[in-house]
């Protein structure tokens, strides 16, 4: 089932929920962080439950088997359906935006290809939530700093139209 | 009843091309990862390539890479591998196979196999 | 790549005798992605056991996996008839997924 935080109004669908791999990590994340870096994976999007937990899996099993990573490299996965999958949570340094930044943020995916269009407004809104989450479980600083993928790293992600989306979020600033 | 039925494999000359079917039944096959695994003439079984449920992601050994393609058609329940550049050593009996996150990925249906011979 | 060496590579037993086989890998695997597959003469390779110690649908109890890291091994109760045929381990921990070389065993 869904688990919902009281302070929050995005739920989190639990690793086992989506019928995820083990995880092999070990690195923890000193917690509270100060930033967020939110990219795509850009492979293919999901609009159910169904689809979207199987494109969680997916994308885990990219990185674990061909990648070696020793989970899905993202802390929390977006999809279209309005739900937020967990990855490797707050607690566990990503794989996400290369060795310098990951144990400084959380990296949160946006599952799908968004160089030509945005992520549905229910995905929006799940990532919006899940950050307040996060401020409100004192995982995030409440002056975190929201960074999309490619202002850390040479990247295309998150995708020109989501880039173009999350510059006018509140907590993002520009490189 | 799960069924996977290979075709398409024969005699090939060096440099030639050659396609792979497997026809799946008796499962959701788009629920499954599809691979395809090969038999030397000398018994070792060696991974050629795997397809995810959904085709986002295709995976190959470096001896293969680029050469050879793995596709798949949920509509229609058939798993392909397209083969080109062909080499004397991909010369093996050709297994499809399915596996999912249901018993970690292990292959627990295979087909009866088809057969490709490289040689000039 | 993770290589997998199987020993020995050809053994026979006799009736009712125990007999093990063994799979090192050169690198560590979880023991959750090390599988087993037997193979006849003429026919394709059946899952046996998964990860490590799963019997597959229709297996007999007789046979049993253990292991972990890097040191893997199959087990026979007690051999029949049955059983000769060769078994393969195989690793899904990493890509490229590689295949042991097998043991072949044979009645004595």
């Known amino acids: 089932q869904e688990t919902e935080d009281p302070a929050c109004c995005s739920p989190i669908v639990p690793r086992n929920e989506w019928k995820a791999l083990a995880s092999e990590c070990a690195q923890h994340l000193s917690l509270p962080l100060r930033y967020v870096v939110v990219s795509h994976t850009a492979g293919s999007s999901c609009n159910t439950p169904a689809s979207c937990q199987q494109q969680a899996r997916n994308v885990q099993h990219y990185h674990m088997k061909t990648l070696g990573w020793c989970d899905v490299g993202y802390n929390f996965l977006i999809g279209e359906d309005g739900l937020v999958y967990e990855g490797r949570g707050w607690n566990f340094t990503g794989a996400h935006s290369g060795h310098l930044w990951n144990p400084m943020s959380i990296g949160i995916s946006f599952m799908g290809n968004y160089m030509d269009r945005v992520p549905t407004p229910q995905a929006i809104r799940a990532a919006q939530g899940l950050l307040a989450c996060g401020v409100a479980q004192g995982a995030l600083r409440s002056n975190y700093v929201l960074k999309g993928h490619r202002d850390v790293q040479r990247t295309l992600s998150p995708g020109n139209q989501l880039y173009h989306l999350i510059q006018n979020w509140p907590h993002y600033r520009s490189p | 009843e799960v069924q996977l039925v290979e075709s398409g494999g024969g005699l090939v000359k060096p440099g030639g091309s050659l396609k792979l079917s497997c026809a799946a039944s008796g499962f959701s096959f788009s629920d499954y990862y599809m691979y395809w695994v090969r038999q030397t003439p000398e018994k070792r079984l060696e991974w050629v390539a795997a397809i995810s449920d959904d085709s986002t992601y295709t995976y190959y050994p470096d001896s293969v890479k680029g050469r050879f393609t793995i596709s798949r058609d949920n509509a229609k329940n058939n798993l392909y591998l397209q083969m080109s550049s062909l080499k004397s050593e991909d010369t093996a009996m050709y297994y499809c196979?399915?596996?999912?996150?249901?018993?970690?990925?292990?292959?627990?249906?295979w087909g009866q196999g088809t057969s490709v011979t490289v040689s000039s | 790549q993770i290589v997998l060496t199987q020993s020995p590579a050809i053994m026979s037993a006799s009736l009712g005798e125990r007999v093990t086989m063994t799979c090192t890998a050169s690198?560590?695997?979880?023991?959750?992605?090390l599988h087993w597959y037997q193979q006849k003469p003429g026919s394709s390779p059946k899952l046996w056991i998964y990860s490590t110690s799963n019997l597959a649908s229709g297996v007999p109890a007789r046979f049993s996996g253990s292991g972990s890291g890097t040191s893997y091994s199959l087990t026979i109760s007690s051999m029949e008839a049955e059983d000769a045929a060769t078994y393969y381990c195989h690793q899904y921990h990493r890509s490229p997924f590689t295949f042991g070389s097998g043991t072949k065993l044979e009645i004595k």
């Open positions: 690198s560590s695997v979880s023991s959750s992605y």
């Open positions: 196979a399915r596996g999912g996150y249901g018993n970690l990925y292990a292959m627990d249906y």
